[in-house]
């Protein structure tokens, strides 16, 4: 594109197109191109103490092209602008400046912040979090049985991370104490962590007590012992429905 830039032509004569190179329509030995072939842009390049005319298919960085009836001319963007559509609309600022509404600024206006990656002034983005998820089952040391007082946790997700000047995110987990009716751990449940095992959806009023099932146990067949346990659990259901969890909220 810029192959002809700065190149001196051999034996050029004023206003004579023969011998002109690099898209010139007319040229002179001293000033280079004087006019350009159709659709090419004319730009003056300073070389030492003099200016040389050059014809280009598009304007160099820091310039934009305007087509007039008599000349297609490259015009300089504003001093702080690297690439522009015209004088009013810069599209890329020079180093150390931030682009805002087509202008280049040393600092971003109030209510906006500098994005040092894109070198633009952008809206401040505040943290956004989801609603809290439901409380987890009441557990102690990772188990859902063999205790009366434990803790339960709930979490929420960060939906939008904040930008540099944005409000920080609030806590995304919350833990509180909980009290349940003490329940013996079943055989095979001992040491199992509540969160590792799939739980049946608790019935109303049973939210604080995990109901064991055969998943994760050594045998998938029901042993007489397990049948007996199930019957005991059924008997407890009535009592469990009346049992309500007493809890104290503590945010960590």
């Amino acid at each position: 594109q810029n192959a002809s830039r700065g190149r001196r032509q051999r034996r050029m004569h004023p206003n004579v197109s023969q011998g002109c190179q690099g898209g010139c329509a007319t040229c002179s030995d001293y000033n280079g191109c004087l006019s350009c072939k159709p659709r090419l842009f004319f730009v003056l390049e300073r070389i030492g103490m003099k200016q040389i005319g050059v014809c280009l298919s598009s304007c160099p960085s820091g310039y934009y092209g305007t087509r007039y009836p008599d000349i297609n001319k490259c015009t300089k963007c504003k001093a702080d602008c690297d690439t522009c559509f015209n004088k009013n609309f810069c599209t890329k600022c020079k180093s150390g400046f931030y682009l805002h509404l087509g202008k280049c600024l040393d600092n971003c206006p109030e209510g906006l912040e500098a994005n040092n990656h894109t070198m633009e002034c952008v809206n401040i983005v505040h943290c956004e979090v989801s609603e809290w998820n439901p409380w987890s089952p009441c557990t102690k040391k990772g188990k859902t049985c063999g205790f009366k007082r434990g803790t339960e946790t709930r979490v929420r997700e960060i939906m939008q991370h904040p930008s540099a000047k944005g409000n920080l995110c609030p806590p995304t987990n919350e833990t509180r104490k909980c009290t349940v009716q003490r329940k013996k751990c079943q055989k095979g449940e001992r040491g199992k962590k509540g969160r590792e095992r799939k739980r049946k959806k608790p019935n109303k009023g049973e939210s604080k007590e995990a109901i064991p099932d055969s998943k994760g146990l050594e045998s998938s067949k029901e042993t007489p012992e397990q049948r007996e346990n199930k019957q005991q659990q059924k008997k407890r259901k009535v009592q469990d429905k009346q049992q309500k969890s007493v809890s104290v909220s503590t945010v960590h």
């Epitope: 305007t66 087509r67 007039y68 559509f85 015209n86 004088k87 009013n88």
Partner: antibody
Amino acid sequence: EVQLVESGGGVVQPGRSLRLSCAASGFTFSDYDMAWVRQAPGKGLEWVATIIYDGSRTYYRDSVKGRFTISRDNSKNTLYLQMNSLRAEDTAVYYCATHDKTFDYWGQGTMVTVSS
Amino acid sequence: DIQLTQSPSSLSASVGDRVTITCRASEDIYSDLAWYQQKPGKAPKLLIYDVNSLIHGVPSRFSGSGSGTDFTLTISSLQPEDFATYYCQQYDNYPNTFGQGTKLEIK
């Protein structure tokens, strides 16, 4: 804030003259090419004339060549349009605008009515 | 002179509609095309330049596309404030010319 305010419009008889002015503020007037664009009642937009930033070159649409003259006074931040030999078809709202490929900033317009 | 022909000349639509206005040039204008919006009694306002570059502050529901001789302005979901007349303009050649306009009316 860029502001362009036109003045000088009015009712004039065919063949007479009128001079429109456009006072500019809020930007470096001497850096910008300026133009006049007109809009006949109920019609579309029509470019009339452009003058480059330093006043050294002017361009006109064919229908106004020889009758209209665009000029500027950079020391006064003012653009002018001298309209001679006015015709009925010159009736329009005349807008001044910055002209840098697109017409980025516009005045509110001044109405010129050519009628006998 | 390069002629720009807009279609349709007028268009009735409802809030929320997707609307497309076309602008056809009589010769290749590359990507030297702009779109303007004009409301009654007001000066035109530049919306888009270089076919698809949105002016800052113009809502993203406005978009432009095309090259050469065929161009479109699309409003993805019409809002009450979008009812106006829209003009295309080419700046590839002097004289810079405008399309005849497309009047967007409420249905």
